[in-house]
C-alpha cells in the first residue's frame, strides 16, 4: 500500500549523512517504472534539502542532524509518477517526528531570585517561587521534566534547614520556626534544577530570602533616668532629649518611637515629640513654668512604636526630674491696662490715680516707676508710690491727643534685680467732660440783600458733650437787635439771622451771644455784608453805570 507510518528520527543524529530513513514504494511499480519525489517544508521549501528521496529507488534520506527544539515534526508529501509524468498515486502524507534527546540543561529564568518573608512566621508559609525552563520534551519523556532542590543555605542559623522547595513547582516555603530578622536578616539559598525529573543535568541559581521586620522588639529607654534644668517662663524650650534603642528595622514603623507623658504633668506644661531622624523623644515646655509656684516636676514617659507590637511586650518608661530655675521676672502692672475716669481741666498737682506693679519674684524687690509715654505731657508719676498727678491741663477736646474721650499713657515699672527687669502698663484716662466751651455759630461771615433779604441760617457747634450742648439760646447785644433778629430753631441747633430794617450797602458787625444748656455763654461777632439787591445774593453787585 501507498502508506508510510510516521517515521521517528532522534534529534542530534551523528550520521553519517545522508542517512536512510524509509523507502517509498508504490505497488504500481509492477506495471510501470515509478519515479518518486517529496514536497513540503524540509524538502523543497524552507528549510530546503533536509530530506531527499532517490528518484528511482524511493529511498527517503535525511541530510543533516535534526533539532527537536527547532522543529519537532516535519510534514512532507510523497509523490509517485510514471515515466510520462502522470501521477500513479495520490500524494502521501509523510510525518517525520523528531524524538527528543536530553541535549539541554535546565535554565533558571533568573540568576538571582529575590523573595521576602516576615520574621517569626509559622512553618508552611510560602516565600517565593523560582522557575527553571528546559527546552527538552517534558510530555513524552522526562528530558525536560525539572525537579527543584535546595543545595545549600547560608547562613545555617538557627539551623541549616530553614526552607524547603517544592520539587515540581519551585515554591520555596518556610519549613522551620525561628526566623529572626534581628539575628539573620537575609538567607542565600543555592537552588538546583535537575532535568530527567531529578536524575539528569543540573543547573544552579541563587534565591535570596529577605527576612522582613515584624515589631517584635519594644523600644527601650537608655538611660531610663534623666535630670533637666529649665528656666521658668520659657515656652517651647527643649527640656531633654530622651534616647531609645529598638532592635527592629531602622526608620520603619516598628522602629519609630511614639512617646507619651504618663504622669507628672498635671498642669499640662510639657509636650513630647519624636525626632524624625534620631528617633529621640524631644521634651519641650508647652507653657512657661513658674519657679515660685513649683520648682520641680517629675515626669513619667512611656515609649511605644508607630506600629503595634506583634506579641505582648513590656513597655519601657523613663523618669525625668525637671528642675525649674528662678529667673528675675519683670514687674507686672495690675491690671496690665488701667482705666481711670478723671475730669478734664483738673488743677495742676491734683492726683489722678495710683498705678502700681507686682513682682512675681519672691524676694522683696524694690519697684520704681516712671512715665514712658505721655504725648501731651499732662501727667507725672511718683517713682516710689506710683501716684499719678496732673501737671498740665487735661483737655478732653484736644483732638491731637485725645481719642474718643480717652487719653492713653504708658508707664514703666523697674525692679532692682540683677540685671533689672522692666514691665509696662497702659493707663487709659477717660476724660469726663466739663462745660468749658460755649456754642459757636458757623459761618461767621454772611452776605445779605437789603431788599427782600433772605434769612441766614447759621449752624451752632459746641465742643463739649451733652448735656453741655443743645438746646442753645441766642441773643443780640450791643444794639445789633435794632437791625437784626436772631432765633434758634425748634431743634435748638441752628440760629436764623434776619435783617429787619433797611441798611445801606456796607459791612456791619452783628454781636451774637449764644448760650448752651448749661448756660455757658459765648459772644461771637458775625461780619455781615449788606448789598443793594433783592432776595438772595452771594457777593454784592458792582455799582451800576448809565450809558
Amino acid at each position: 500500500d501507498w502508506v508510510v507510518a510516521p517515521i521517528s528520527v532522534p534529534e542530534n543524529g551523528k550520521g553519517p549523512f545522508p542517512q536512510r530513513l524509509n523507502q517509498l514504494k508504490s505497488n504500481k511499480d509492477r506495471d510501470t517504472k515509478i519515479f518518486y519525489s517529496i514536497t513540503g517544508p524540509g524538502a523543497d521549501s524552507p528549510p530546503e534539502g533536509v530530506f531527499a528521496v532517490e528518484k528511482e529507488t524511493g529511498w527517503l534520506l535525511l541530510n543533516k542532524p535534526l533539532d527537536r527544539e527547532e522543529i519537532a515534526k516535519y510534514e512532507l508529501f510523497g509523490h509517485a509518477v510514471s515515466e510520462n509524468g502522470a501521477s500513479v498515486e495520490d500524494p502521501m502524507n509523510i510525518s517525520i517526528i523528531v524524538t527528543d534527546q536530553n541535549d539541554h540543561k535546565p535554565k533558571f529564568t533568573q540568576d538571582t531570585f529575590r523573595g521576602s518573608v516576615l520574621e517569626g512566621v509559622l512553618p508552611g508559609t510560602s516565600v517565593m517561587q523560582v522557575t527553571a525552563t528546559d527546552e527538552d520534551d517534558a510530555i513524552y519523556t522526562y528530558n525536560g521534566v525539572v525537579a527543584y532542590s535546595i543545595h545549600s543555605q547560608e547562613p545555617k542559623d538557627p539551623h541549616d534547614l530553614m526552607f524547603t522547595i517544592h520539587r515540581s513547582t519551585g515554591t520555596i516555603s518556610v519549613i522551620s520556626s525561628g526566623l529572626d530578622r534581628e539575628k539573620v536578616p537575609e538567607y542565600t539559598l543555592t537552588i538546583q534544577a535537575t532535568d530527567m525529573d531529578g536524575d539528569g543535568s543540573t543547573t544552579t541559581a541563587v534565591a535570596v530570602v529577605e527576612i522582613l521586620d515584624a515589631n517584635d522588639n519594644a523600644p527601650m529607654f537608655d538611660p531610663q533616668k534623666y535630670e533637666a534644668h529649665v528656666p521658668e517662663n520659657a515656652v517651647g524650650h527643649e527640656v531633654q532629649r530622651l534616647t531609645v534603642t529598638d532592635l527592629d528595622a531602622p526608620n520603619s514603623p516598628a522602629w519609630r518611637a511614639t512617646y507619651l507623658i504618663m504622669g507628672g504633668d498635671d498642669g499640662d506644661h510639657f509636650t513630647i515629640t519624636t525626632h524624625p531622624e534620631s528617633n529621640q523623644g524631644i521634651l519641650t515646655t508647652r507653657k512657661g513654668l513658674d519657679f515660685e509656684a513649683k520648682n520641680q516636676h517629675t515626669l513619667y514617659v512611656e515609649v511605644t512604636n508607630e506600629a503595634p507590637f506583634v506579641l505582648k511586650l513590656p513597655t519601657s518608661t523613663a523618669t525625668i526630674v525637671v528642675h525649674v530655675e528662678d529667673v528675675n521676672e519683670a514687674p507686672v502692672f495690675v491690671p496690665p491696662s488701667k482705666v481711670v475716669e478723671v475730669q478734664e481741666g483738673i488743677p495742676t498737682g491734683e492726683p489722678v490715680c495710683v498705678y502700681t506693679a507686682e513682682d512675681p519674684d519672691k524676694e522683696n524687690q524694690k519697684i520704681s516707676y516712671r512715665i514712658l509715654r505721655d504725648p501731651a505731657g499732662w501727667l507725672a508719676m511718683d517713682p516710689d508710690s506710683g501716684q499719678v498727678t496732673a501737671v498740665g491741663t487735661l483737655d478732653r477736646e484736644d483732638e491731637q491727643f485725645v481719642r474718643n474721650n480717652i487719653y492713653e499713657v504708658m508707664v514703666l515699672a523697674m525692679d532692682n534685680g540683677s540685671p533689672p527687669t522692666t514691665g509696662t502698663g497702659t493707663l487709659l484716662l477717660t476724660l469726663i467732660d466739663v462745660n468749658d466751651h460755649g456754642p459757636v455759630p458757623e459761618p461767621r461771615q454772611i452776605t445779605i440783600c437789603n431788599q427782600s433779604p433772605v434769612r441766614q441760617v447759621l449752624n451752632i457747634t459746641d465742643k463739649d458733650l451733652s448735656p453741655h450742648t443743645s438746646p442753645f439760646q441766642a441773643q443780640l447785644t450791643d444794639d445789633s437787635d435794632i437791625y437784626w433778629t436772631a432765633e434758634v430753631n425748634e431743634e435748638g441747633d441752628t440760629v436764623v439771622l434776619s435783617l429787619k430794617k433797611f441798611l445801606k450797602q456796607d459791612t456791619y458787625d452783628v454781636h451774637l451771644s449764644l448760650s448752651d444748656h448749661g448756660n455757658k455763654e459765648q459772644l461771637t461777632v458775625i461780619r455781615a455784608t449788606v448789598c443793594d439787591c433783592h432776595g438772595h445774593v452771594e457777593t454784592c453787585p458792582g455799582p451800576w453805570k448809565g450809558g
Partner: antibody, heavy 118, light 107 residues
Amino acid sequence: EVQLLESGGGLVQPGGSLRLSCAASGFTFSSYAMSWVRQAPGKGLEWVSTISSGGHYTYYPDSVKGRFTISRDNAKNTLYLQMNSLRAEDTAVYYCASYYYGIPFGYWGQGTLVTVSS
Amino acid sequence: DIQMTQSPSTLSASLGDRVTITCRASQDIGINLIWLQQKPGKAPKRLIYDTSSLDSGVPSRFSGSGSGTEFTLTISSLQPDDFATYYCLQYGSSPLTFGGGTKVEIK
C-alpha cells in the same frame, strides 16, 4: 546505463589547487547524493567528501576539511571537487561515486589521477 | 573514527573453492556495511549492501553475513572472474571508513 566520467586530474605542485569534475548520465543525477573517494597508488580506498542531492549539505573527513570543497550543478549533471593547499599525500586516483538505495557507493566512475609533486 | 580490520590481506585459492573474507569493526555498526570488488586498474564495484543484500547483477555465489562488529563475505565457488581485491566499508558512523582490502589470487 549509469555513467560517471571524472576529469581535471593532473600534476600539481604542493600548495597548489586543482578542480576535478564528474559528468553523470543514465540516471536522475539531481536526486542522488554523490561522493568522492580516492586511492593512493598501491593503497586502499579513502572517503574524501559527500554532497546531498540538492547540494545543501556537504560532509568531509578531518583529513581534507577546510582544504577541499565539494559542489554540484544539477542543471549540468556535474559534480565538482575543488582542491586547495594540495600536499604530496593527496596524490591518488580520485573516483566519483553515487549513493544508491540510500547508501554508498552504488556506482563509480573510472577515476582521474592527481599527482602532487614538486 | 571506526577502524575496519580486514583479514586476511591476501588469500590464495583455487577455482571452485569456498572463500571467506572477514571484516571486524572497532565499534558496533549494526548492519551498515558494504562489500566492494576492485580489479586492477579498474574502479571498485559494489557487491553487497546492508551486510547481506546483493546488488542487482551480482552472482548469487556471493553472500554476506554478520552484524555489530563481525562481518564476512563468502564466495561459495570461486570463479575466474572473482580474482580481485575486496574491500569492506562501514557507513554506520561518520566518517565512512574502508577496510584495508583482501587480495584474492590464484593458488
